[in-house]
């Protein structure tokens, strides 16, 4: 009997998507490339449930982890790598006092119990996201 695996080996399934939490570190741009190489995208967050799930994964492992959010195109205008803007209800996830753009901090990371902006050239862990395979039929 063939079992259906909605996600590749070492990926985590959550609400119809597959997530890969890296075990190595890269800068923000290279993290984007790493996700593209496996047919995925540096994680773009669409719901509060998804945010809570990812924040928990990141804080559990006590890692600073890149997400697909930056204000590289226009300072102060935060945009996801899929081109969509940071929506009002997601701004609550910034840690207190963030984003503060201290010394050109233009890329967003999971940090502790919320988000932080940091320098994009720093090496950090990253999370990729792609749609899960359909197991119907």
């Amino acid at each position: 009997e063939r079992l259906c695996h909605p996600c590749p080996w070492e990926w985590t399934f959550f609400q119809g998507n597959c997530y890969f939490m890296s075990n190595s570190q890269r800068n923000w741009h290279d993290s984007i490339t790493a996700c593209q190489e496996v047919g995925a995208q540096l994680v773009v967050i669409k719901s509060a449930e998804e945010q809570n799930f990812l924040q928990l994964q990141s804080s559990r492992s006590n890692r600073f982890t890149w997400m697909g959010l930056s204000d590289l195109n226009h300072e102060g205008t935060w945009q996801w790598v899929d081109g969509s803007p940071l929506l009002p209800s997601f701004k609550q996830y910034w840690n207190k006092g963030e984003p503060n753009n201290v010394g050109e901090e233009d890329c967003a990371e999971f940090s502790g119990n919320g988000w932080n902006d940091d320098k994009c050239n720093l090496a950090k862990f990253w999370i990729c996201k792609k749609s899960a395979a359909s197991c119907s039929g």
Partner: antibody, heavy 119, light 112 residues
Framework: QVTLRESGPALVKPTQTLTLTCTFS??????????VSWIRQPPGKALEWLAL???????YYSTSLKTRLTISKDTSKNQVVLTMTNMDPVDTATYYC???????????WGQGTMVTVSS | QSVLTQPPSVSGAPGQRVTISCTGS?????????VHWYQQLPGTAPKLLIY???NRPSGVPDRFSGSKSGTSASLAITGLQAEDEADYYC???????????FGGGTKLTVLG
């Protein structure tokens, strides 16, 4: 109790600029998580989202109308203003302002103001 | 043509159950964005009926329920009453359009 009220001209001529004001009470647009949006509804047709401004003064616009719209707020007066340039008869609609709190639901609406575009 | 597709009309007799579907795509409902539902009684402004897929604001009867799966969502109304006759709209966010979007609306007629 949250209330919103729209005001503006009932009739505008083609090519003119429409200015609508939303006056609200029961919440503050300086409170984190609060936003105010403009939504319109042509007679007998569906709702169409136009623009939104949040407590942070970040502005969001409908892609198809972006070049014609400007949204702004006056926190001290509890008002949000929408301007729409180059009005056309197809812009005839009831214009609503609505509050959006967290999770992107429009949880309180004004009664709407009907705007007719005609020469 | 609305980004979220709803049936133009549905009908049912008092006491019956009706459902209204809202079909989207991978850039809105299927992407994981929340779905909300509004009721618009004739000649009045819309009113929030269901928020975040399945939650009822206080004051909304438990005859109204919402669900979401994949790229679609649905609103169910049980024990239909004459006062439920109204237009119903679904709403979500669309990342391709970078904006909030509504369905085309569904007119509910309560028969008899």
């Amino acid at each position: 109790q949250v209330t919103l009220r729209e005001s503006g001209p009932a009739l505008v001529k083609p090519t003119q600029t429409l200015t609508l004001t939303c006056t609200f009470s029961g919440f503050s647009l300086s409170t984190s998580g609060m936003s105010v949006s403009w939504i319109r509804q042509p007679p007998g047709k569906a709702l169409e989202w136009l623009a939104l401004i949040d407590w942070d003064d970040d502005k969001y616009y409908s892609t198809s109308l972006k070049t014609r719209l400007t949204i702004s707020k006056d926190t001290s007066k509890n008002q949000v203003v929408l301007t729409m340039t180059n009005m056309d008869p197809v812009d005839t609609a009831t214009y609503y302002c609505a509050r959006m709190a967290l999770r992107h639901a429009f949880d309180a609406w004004g009664q709407g103001t009907m705007v007719t575009v005609s020469s | 043509q609305s980004v979220l597709t709803q049936p133009p009309s549905v009908s049912g007799a008092p006491g019956q159950r009706v459902t209204i579907s809202c079909t989207g795509s991978s850039s809105n409902i299927g992407a994981g964005y929340d779905v909300h539902w509004y009721q618009q009684l004739p000649g009045t402004a819309p009113k929030l009926l269901i928020y975040v897929n399945s939650n009822r604001p206080s004051g909304v009867p438990d005859r109204f329920s919402g669900s979401k799966s994949g790229t679609s969502a649905s609103l169910a109304i049980t024990g239909l009453q004459a006062e439920d006759e109204a237009d119903y709209y679904c709403q979500s966010y669309d990342s391709s359009l970078s904006g909030w979007v509504f369905g085309g609306g569904t007119k509910l007629t309560v028969l008899g």
